[in-house]
Amino acid sequence: GSGIFQLRLQEFVNQRGMLANGQSCEPGCRTFFRICLKHFQATFSEGPCTFGNVSTPVLGTNSFVVRDKNSGSGRNPLQLPFNFTWPGTFSLNIQAWHTPGDDLRPETSPGNSLISQIIIQGSLAVGKIWRTDEQNDTLTRLSYSYRVICSDNYYGESCSRLCKKRDDHFGHYECQPDGSLSCLPGWTGKYCDQPICLSGCHEQNGYCSKPDECICRPGWQGRLCNECIPHNGCRHGTCSIPWQCACDEGWGGLFCDQDLNYCTHHSPCKNGSTCSNSGPKGYTCTCLPGYTGEHCELGLSKCASNPCRNGGSCKDQENSYHCLCPPGYYGQHCEHSTLTCADSPCFNGGSCRERNQGSSYACECPPNFTGSNCEKKVDRCTSNPCANGGQCQNRGPSRTCRCRPGFTGTHCELHISDCARSPCAHGGTCHDLENGPVCTCPAGFSGRRCEVRITHDACASGPCFNGATCYTGLSPNNFVCNCPYGFVGSRCEFPVGLPPSFPWVA
């Protein structure tokens, strides 16, 4: 049932032991009660007890106090359960009877006689508080109290709201006094069946099956599922959406495993050689004279620097060399001459000047020639003066270095950033590349330097769905949608179940 009408009998007084018909009971009035509860009637009539009826055993003789009793025969208060919405009004008939027969089941005995009866009509709200009353007639007095309460799991003003507390798959709640659900800690939702995830757990990328947990969806990691998982194999890179690999500063290659600053990080070039971050291995060593090898680790022959002058021939010796001088010359490097100007020793139009009273000479060489006898054509590139892979070129009496992109200076010794000049207009982002800068343009602009204003902005109409980012500038009247995780399509309009190992990320 949904509720119980409770009647507590407290005291019955029949001092003279009289029946309603004026006769007296012998030896005394052995009293029991019949109770009839029905819908509200302005004038109480006989007929069925529509809300219920109940009888008591014999509770006493003539006058007596009725004690509370919670179980068994003679229970007090009396219980009249109902299983409908309590209407808030009622009619109650309480009759006191005398029985000559069985104490416990006087209802069944013949010869029962009415002592007195009372009728109560009125309104009564559901509640815990007892309403106390006392009724008198010429012969008797009855003290009693009554109330209506809801049965277990029923709530509300008319006991019409069913609520049974639970803590299982279908809900986790207790019941409020009005019958509404009160979720247990960690649960929410209409039926308290949705767990409250760990505080801060990402709404889209994480979920939970019980309170205070945060389970990451594919492609996400971290305590709060707010860190994307980069592409498998990504070494020195990060991601902004799952399965990406965007290289950290100084790293390149598809998996960001190529050191773009190899020279700085590893110093591979030996013996004072110059290192440049280029070439198939990511670096190139330019050796000083006297050294060779990929890392300039090999010392060249001692004769490699051509130390013998005046056409002397060089012979390697352990830790040294020896010059074999041609006729007319002597000294460690064949630097001294036994010739004089009379022997016309100066080649290539050189002028001879006598020295030491004509016992020796010196040649003054014309431009582009050198050597004691002007026998050597000047090659200003022999010392490898150009750094960072620059090309040396002889230009008459001088030489110039032709630098690779990204380098400048007389000897190509200075590294320049193409982006330092801020070549990208209208807030474009500049990227230094080996063959010049590349600009990534903001919406509304295009061109190599973002200099072209797109009169029709293809992104203005918001063509991309599901939070995708719109880019223009790839071609003036076109746009590209960069889809968030979980969506594909030219406008990111289709949700997709991503495969676990290599999901398509649009």
Partner: nanobody, 120 residues
């Protein structure tokens, strides 16, 4: 929608050759670098080559240097991987990828892959 579609995979004997193609759509082809990586069962992916947007800068992994060549044909929006002197250890799924920028620096989009099996 950016799409990269690989083709040309198959079964080949050791010492043989294959040419893989990667056809791109959904973006201006000349703007992005494009490369190839491969993944053998139970192994990490390996970046094997990449060609910059201009085609001027190409790099190769040591394991394929001298045997594989990457080229791009802007007219056909296609990048090729010419594989010569193939070895059994070249067996893998080959993927075409782009970092979404002009330089070979990372991966943003990639295709579904094509299987290459080198076996006698």
């Amino acid at each position: 929608e950016v799409q990269l579609v690989e083709s040309g995979g198959g079964l080949v004997q050791p010492g043989g050759s294959l040419r893989l193609s990667c056809t791109a759509s959904g973006f201006t082809f000349d703007v992005y670098a494009i490369g190839w990586f491969r993944q053998a069962p139970g192994k990490e992916p390996e970046g094997i080559s990449c060609i910059s947007s201009s085609g001027s800068i190409t790099y190769y992994a040591d394991s394929v240097k001298g045997r594989f060549t990457t080229s791009r044909d802007s007219a056909k929006n296609t990048v090729y991987l010419q594989m010569n002197s193939l070895k059994p250890e070249d067996t893998a799924v080959y993927y075409c990828a782009t970092p979404g920028i002009a330089a070979c620096r990372g991966i943003h989009y990639w295709g579904q892959g094509t299987q290459v099996t080198v076996s006698s």
